[in-house]
């Protein structure tokens, strides 16, 4: 599909990302496909990631992601998480798309991916408080490592948005 056609299709619902950074993918003979992420987003595997520098509540962070046709980060693999960690600042905490709306420790990902306790990356002492119903990625100095921490959803934090790559 030509980018001009894509633009045409998108203008009806407003083009959010006016500049894309694309990589050519190897396709069958006489077909060229481009795999793109919006400018200033990070690319990894089949997704694009935006790391905010502004702080907001969990709900507002999710809304900000939605405005960019994305959602708060859903962590599916260790490799994906390690990639994200490499791009974060150790002194900040970042909301991800995991929350416990009822405070019953029934964790839910924003995209409905099933929560799997055996594939979690909680810091050793976490989650620490059922009144803390949203999850951030943060860096702990002892032991030195990134991990998950439950926090108050209203407390402003930075965030990570995720969207699937755009294919042209």
């Amino acid at each position: 599909q030509k980018y001009s056609q894509l633009l045409e299709k998108k203008t009806t619902k407003e083009l959010v990302h006016t500049t894309l950074e694309c990589v050519k993918k190897n396709m069958p003979v006489e077909e060229t496909a481009w795999s793109c992420c919006p400018k200033n987003w990070k690319s990894f595997s089949s997704n694009c990631y935006f790391i905010s520098t502004e702080s907001a509540s969990w709900q507002d962070s999710e809304k900000d992601c939605a405005r960019m046709e994305a959602h708060l980060l859903v962590i599916n693999t260790q490799e994906e998480q390690d990639f994200i960690f490499q791009n974060l600042q150790e002194e900040s905490a970042y909301f991800v798309g995991l929350s416990d709306p009822e405070g019953q420790r029934h964790w839910q990902w924003v995209d409905q991916t099933p929560y799997n306790e055996s594939s979690t990356f909680w810091h050793p002492r976490e989650p620490s408080d059922p009144n803390e119903r949203c999850v951030v990625l943060n860096f702990r100095k002892s032991p030195k490592r990134w991990g998950w921490n439950d926090v108050n959803c209203l407390g402003p934090q930075r965030s990570v948005c995720e969207m699937m790559k755009i294919h042209l």
């Epitope: 420790r105 306790e117 909680w122 002492r125 620490s128 059922p130």
Partner: antibody, heavy 117, light 107 residues
Framework: QVQLQQSGTELMKPGASVKISCKAT????????IEWVKQRPGHGLEWIGE????????NDNEKFKGKATITADTSSKKAYMQLSSLTSEDSAVYYC??????????WGQGTLVSVSA | ETTVTQSPASLSMAIGEKVTIRCVTS??????VNWYQQKPGEPPKLLIS???TLRAGVPSRFSSSGYGTDFVFTIENMLSEDVADYYC?????????FGGGTKLEIK
């Protein structure tokens, strides 16, 4: 209100095992970490380990690895600690406590375990 | 493991005096220190939780301060009912570790 009721005194022989319990009431058992703490006269307080009942996740003090096993049953709202291969060094009062944030906010009354031949 | 050194081990104070107990940790634990009071035959009672936060229902004569590795617990005007053992607990790192305790008596 939050209450932790522990099982009664245990008089044990060296080499035996004992399983003590901690029954939680007044809150959602599965959502808070339960701690186990040992107290011997002249030895102060020692943290043994903790469990988050809803997930079964545990954190253990290396010092008690092989000695203490912590489990929980959400249906009965009970946490358990089994102590194996008992010696006189294991004679102590054992407390369970519920964590809130990073504080041991609510405590059981304690279970005395006495080991002697 | 974070070791916690609590001092003094025992303290004899007159009613109305100011009591100060100190805990020093071997690693930086921000302000994740708790302070407990224990009377004979009873479990420890949480007085002050992490962040130097006085627990609900605890008299305001109890307070604490400190950050990093150095922490101080204070009783502003000692009463006879304050006679007890006092412990600090560092909850910043696993394994959690307690100070050795301070036995507070009346002079």
């Amino acid at each position: 209100q939050v209450q932790l009721q522990q099982s009664g005194t245990e008089l044990m022989k060296p080499g035996a095992s004992v399983k003590i319990s901690c029954k939680a009431t007044g809150y959602t058992f599965s959502t808070y970490w339960i701690e186990w703490v040992k107290q011997r006269p002249g030895h102060g307080l020692e943290w043994i380990g903790e469990i988050l009942p809803g997930s079964g996740r545990t954190n253990d003090n290396e010092k008690f690895k092989g000695k203490a096993t912590i489990t929980a049953d959400t249906s009965s709202k009970k946490a358990y600690m089994q102590l194996s291969s008992l010696t006189s060094e294991d004679s102590a009062v054992y407390y369970c406590a519920r964590r809130g944030g990073y504080s041991f906010a609510f405590w059981g009354q304690g279970t005395l375990v006495s080991v002697s031949a | 493991e974070t070791t916690v050194t609590q001092s003094p081990a025992s303290l004899s104070m007159a009613i109305g005096e100011k009591v100060t107990i100190r805990c020093v940790t071997s690693t930086d634990i921000d302000d994740d220190v708790n302070w407990y009071q224990q009377k004979p035959g009873e479990p420890p009672k949480l007085l002050i939780s992490e962040g130097n936060t006085l627990r609900a229902g605890v008299p305001s004569r109890f307070s604490s301060s400190g950050y990093g590795t150095d922490f101080v617990f204070t009783i502003e005007n000692m009463l006879s009912e304050d006679v007890a053992d006092y412990y600090c607990l560092q909850s910043g790192n696993l394994p959690y570790t307690f100070g050795g305790g301070t036995k507070l008596e009346i002079k």
